[in-house]
Interface confidence: medium
């Protein structure tokens, strides 16, 4: 067959292509951030000739548009400025209520570079209606202005734009509205990945539950489903895998379906797994049905077996027939475990379609949902148990009314969106699921997304100031008990002048605790050894401190999770019978073990544990230092086998106010604290003011830098007698 | 004061060896990282490799890698350079660079020639 | 290896007049909250002198018309009104990791 012509160039932007110049290849352009390609793709038909979908003639040059942003068509109550046809990238709209009605929302946006106004619709209230009036987003129209019970509202877009969101809302007992707030947007516009990942996240995690289910709280961030850890979630993940997907996109899509499999499993639900691949058929590579959609290992590597060329001889996309199969799935699941049966009832169920564009056979995907919804008995009262979270990648050829279609319609939530590329994916799925807003006690979990703050990222992490000391670190370790280092308390008794600063969604300085009590080593002296010619030795360099008030669990106070309980063993998804040696084994593993202390500034900073022979090399360094250690003859008589070693090569080194602070590790999506930060033998922050600054040791300097943490493997005994009944430790 | 002196002029045929000394007055010779740096005529600045005096431990260019050797004789605070299977685009300044605390070359050696003409 | 390429190779500059020099690094050379490139003058015939160490600090006893910028790989020295002893070549050289290297060099004549 001959191939297509090769002058497609657009000029300020790029193009790429599915298969090459032969036919069937889907070109697709791109253009720069607040720029948009018309038009947006091309097809290599047969005959050799190009074909530009919905264009009359078959090749128009094709060039990079501004992107604008859609004006407001109306506005109840107030009035907004400028008033324009649509708005340049960077355009700003203001608005205004009229006297004795409140302003919700955001009072001025700002248009962003992918075609969307940035904050929140703003909405200007009197709070008259049973319901608050549910606003009318910026390009839509609404119809209905009465919002008593059961009253609906409906809402339209001007020609050319897309809604998505609820078309028809209706008034609800309790004061809100059904489905999700509508938009109405442009074809070319899409989501960023910052926006998704949160919305994605905050819908999916509060579906992941670890929530507690006794706590009922009125959250802006949308529903909390209370999945108690014993409830069970199966997740349907379809992977489009039509022509139009090339091989390499399929192959992000297989990672990113890999990335949040392996999150999910992080969770302390029950949870099974089912992969479907589609085009014109689906094809079912692990049903929930089967025991192994509940090992990770075992849904990660059928995802990795899933091959593009399953589905070369099919080449369409039938969105229906793959939904129709996560049906036969349910049917069988439900049939299996009996229809009235607690255990069929209480299955949360969760969709997500990767797709790259419209269906285009096998029947309305609406249908199969539709049956989905009936088998599930989706009603009101149990809208909870099914979420489908339709995303398609590739900004220009998507259908957003068919995604928006299949994606659930949930007060405060989005189910539906459409991302620029694969790329754009990837990092989503990074950064979805965010179990940080959980309130109870999960422990070792931090935010992980580009945009959290520190204190998002270690919720754990305290600052102690006692008196008239510089300031110490330390961690959570449960909502009320601190781990520190005892060095910082070696002047005075008198806690009653300490504080304990501890991360708070409210304030960007936390909020200060007072101590209840604290519980100092007896082994810690650090004189003990001085005759030795050691003039400062730092065995049983541990402390807790026990917190006046228990603290809220938030996005940015929640504990670590400390190795030997229970808690950690959940979070390392390790069997029952498990032991603290077998902690030990999984989390220092090798004879270099990445791991993290916070600096002074709040950020995360890198270290190497070394261990075995590693370790020996890393400590024997410390016979040079003839300050501290005058006559030194045996390091281990300074570095005894409590202390863990870093400071080699790249490793970051902890400053004298860090010391204290959790030596942590990630597993799983997950932090455990393995050390504390001890002693040390060059302090970057020496002569420095300035929190961000530190200055790494010169090469030649003599000794190297190295640094020493309390081995918590190594302080069980001490650390059960004080948190027996606060932990749940595993054997030894 | 610090002083980095280094030694004299050297005329070397093709394949042969030339070893450059410096001699390191005014601070603690085991402290501070010796850096060797090379330039030919009109042309910029090559650093060679790098030697610790105190654990003797050798950082090299990968360019150098087999050819240059760095060595240190503590007791005399000097510090050496040996370039073997000398070629003529080795004719050059050989300079040693004493780091400061920032690891920048805060002290030069005054620079020693060497030619490798046959 | 860290390649720096310096900007321009030579330039001509009136006395009392402002000159700027860069030095863009393919790689970051930032750690632990420092930029570890520094600037070196050398006259003919002479050793290369230290002017600015950690990208922005002035060396002891260098007059302060010399002054450094930048951040991970985009460096600037700028020397505010130039003297006649200012004519040299100009060189930046990284040491956030071996091998360390240098820039190209710059020549700044006199006008």
């Known amino acids: 067959a001959p191939s297509c012509p090769q002058n497609v160039n657009i000029s300020g932007g790029t193009f790429t292509l599915s298969h090459g110049w032969a036919p069937g290849s889907l070109l697709t352009y791109s253009c720069p951030q607040g720029l948009y390609p018309s038009p947006a793709s091309r097809l290599c038909k047969s005959s050799g000739q190009w074909q530009t979908p919905g264009a009359t003639r078959s090749l128009s040059k094709a060039v990079c548009k501004p992107v604008r942003c859609p004006a407001p068509v109306s506005f109840e109550n107030g009035i907004y400025t400028p008033r324009l046809g649509s708005y340049p990238v960077g355009g700003n709209v203001s608005f205004e209520c009229e006297d004795g009605f409140i302003l919700r929302g955001s009072p001025v946006r700002q248009c962003r570079p992918n075609g969307m106004w940035d904050g929140e619709t703003a909405v200007c209230d009197n709070g008259a209606g049973y319901c608050s009036n549910p606003g009318i987003p910026i390009g839509t129209r609404k119809v209905g202005s009465q919002y008593r019970l059961e009253d609906s509202v409906t809402y339209h877009c001007s020609r050319g734009l897309t809604l998505r969101g609820s078309q028809r809302r209706t008034c609800q007992e309790g004061g809100s509205w059904s489905g999700t707030e509508p938009s109405c947007q442009d074809p070319y516009s899409y989501d960023f990945p910052e926006d998704v990942a949160p919305a994605l996240g905050t819908s999916f995690s509060h579906m992941l539950g670890a929530t507690n289910p006794t706590q009922k709280t009125k959250e802006s961030l949308g529903r909390k489903i209370q999945i108690q850890r014993s409830g069970h979630l199966n997740l349907y993940l379809l992977l489009d895998c039509s022509q139009s997907v090339s091989e390499n996109d399929f192959l992000i899509f297989k990672e990113s379906a890999s990335l949040m499999v392996d999150r999910i499993f992080s969770f302390e639900i029950n949870v099974s797994v089912a992969i479907i691949t589609f085009a014109s058929e689906p094809k079912v590579l692990m049903s929930v049905l089967n025991d192994n959609s509940r090992d990770m290992t075992e849904v990660i590597s059928s995802l990795e077996n899933a091959n593009y060329k399953d589905h070369e001889n099919g080449t369409g996309t039938n969105t229906y027939a793959a939904l129709n199969s996560v049906y036969l799935m349910m049917n069988n699941q439900m049939r299996l475990l009996g229809m009235e049966t607690m255990a069929w009832q209480e299955i949360r169920h969760a969709i997500i379609l990767l797709t790259d564009g419209k269906s285009n056979m096998g029947g309305s995907p609406k249908t199969a949902v539709d049956h989905i919804r009936e088998i599930l008995n989706i009603n009101q009262k149990r809208n909870d148990y099914l979420d489908i979270y339709a995303i398609g990648v590739g900004k220009l050829d998507v259908d957003w009314r068919e995604l928006n279609e299949l994606g659930s319609k949930k007060d405060g939530e989005r189910h539906a969106f459409i991302l620029q590329d694969t790329k754009a994916l990837h990092q989503v799925f990074e950064h979805m699921l965010d179990v940080s807003k959980l309130t109870d006690t999960i422990c070792g979990v931090g935010n992980m997304s580009a945009n959290a703050s520190d204190q998002e990222r270690t919720p754990w992490h305290v600052t102690i100031k006692p008196k008239s000391q510089e300031t110490c670190r330390g961690a959570l370790i449960s909502d009320q008990w601190v781990l520190t280092a005892a060095h910082c308390f070696r002047d005075g008794n008198d806690h009653s002048l300490w504080r304990v600063n501890v991360g708070d969604p409210k304030s960007q300085w936390g909020k200060e605790f007072l101590i209840e009590k604290a519980v100092i080593s007896p082994g810690f002296d650090v004189f003990a050894k001085k005759n030795q010619g050691i003039l400062e030795f730092y065995g049983d360099d541990i402390a807790l401190l026990k917190l006046a008030q228990k603290v809220k669990m938030s996005t940015h106070a929640r504990p670590i999770c400390l190795p030997c309980t229970m808690e950690a063993n959940l979070a390392l998804r390790r069997p029952q019978g498990s032991t603290c040696r077998d902690h030990e084994n999984e989390l220092l593993n090798k004879q270099s073990v990445p791991a993290h202390f916070v600096a002074l500034n709040g950020s995360k900073l890198n270290i190497n544990l070394k261990m075995g022979v590693e370790w020996t090399s890393c400590a024997e360094v410390v016979s040079q230092e003839k300050t501290m250690f005058p006559n030194l003859t045996d390091v281990r008589e300074v570095v005894t086998d409590q202390f863990l070693c870093s400071g080699t090569q790249e490793d970051e080194s902890p400053c004298k106010g860090e010391s204290g602070g959790a030596v942590f590790l990630e597993r799983r999506f997950r932090f455990f604290q393995v050390g504390l930060v001890s002693w040390g033998l060059y302090n970057p922050c020496l002569g420095s003011a300035d929190k961000n600054s530190r200055k790494r040791a010169p090469r030649s300097k003599v000794p190297p830098p190295r640094d020493f943490h309390i081995n918590l493997f190594r302080m069980q005994p001490w650390l059960r007698q004080h948190l027996g009944d606060v932990l749940n430790f595993l054997p030894l | 004061e610090v002083q980095l002196v280094q030694s004299g002029a050297e005329v070397k045929k093709p394949g042969a060896s030339v070893k450059v000394s410096c001699k390191a007055s005014g601070y603690t010779f085991t402290d501070y990282n010796m850096d060797w740096v090379r330039q030919a005529t009109g042309q910029g600045l090559e650093w060679i490799g790098d030697?610790?005096?105190?654990?003797?431990?050798?950082g090299y260019n990968q360019k150098f890698k087999g050819r240059a050797t760095m060595t240190v004789n503590k007791s005399i605070s000097t510090a050496y350079m040996e370039l073997s299977s000398l070629r003529s685009e080795d004719t050059a300044v050989y300079y040693c660079?004493?780091?400061?605390?920032?690891?920048?070359?805060?002290?030069w050696g005054q620079g020693t020639l060497v030619t490798v003409s046959s | 290896d860290n390649v720096l390429t310096q900007s321009p190779d030579s330039l001509a500059v009136s006395l009392g007049e402002r000159a700027t020099i860069s030095c863009r690094a393919s790689k970051s050379v930032r750690t632990s909250g420092y930029n570890y490139m520094h600037w070196y003058q050398q006259k003919p015939g002479q050793p290369p002198k230290l002017l600015i160490y950690?990208?922005?600090n002035l060396k002891s006893g260098v007059p302060d018309r010399f002054s450094g910028s930048g951040s991970g790989t985009d460096f600037t020295l700028t020397i505010s009104s130039l003297q006649a002893e200012d004519a040299a070549t100009y060189y930046c050289?990284?040491?956030?990791?071996?091998?360390?290297?240098f820039g190209q060099g710059t020549k700044l004549e006199i006008k």
């Open positions: 660079a004493r780091e400061d605390d920032h690891d920048a070359f805060a002290y």
């Open positions: 050289q990284h040491s956030r990791e071996l091998p360390y290297t």
């Open positions: 950690l990208a922005s």
């Open positions: 030697i610790n005096p105190n654990y003797e431990s050798t």
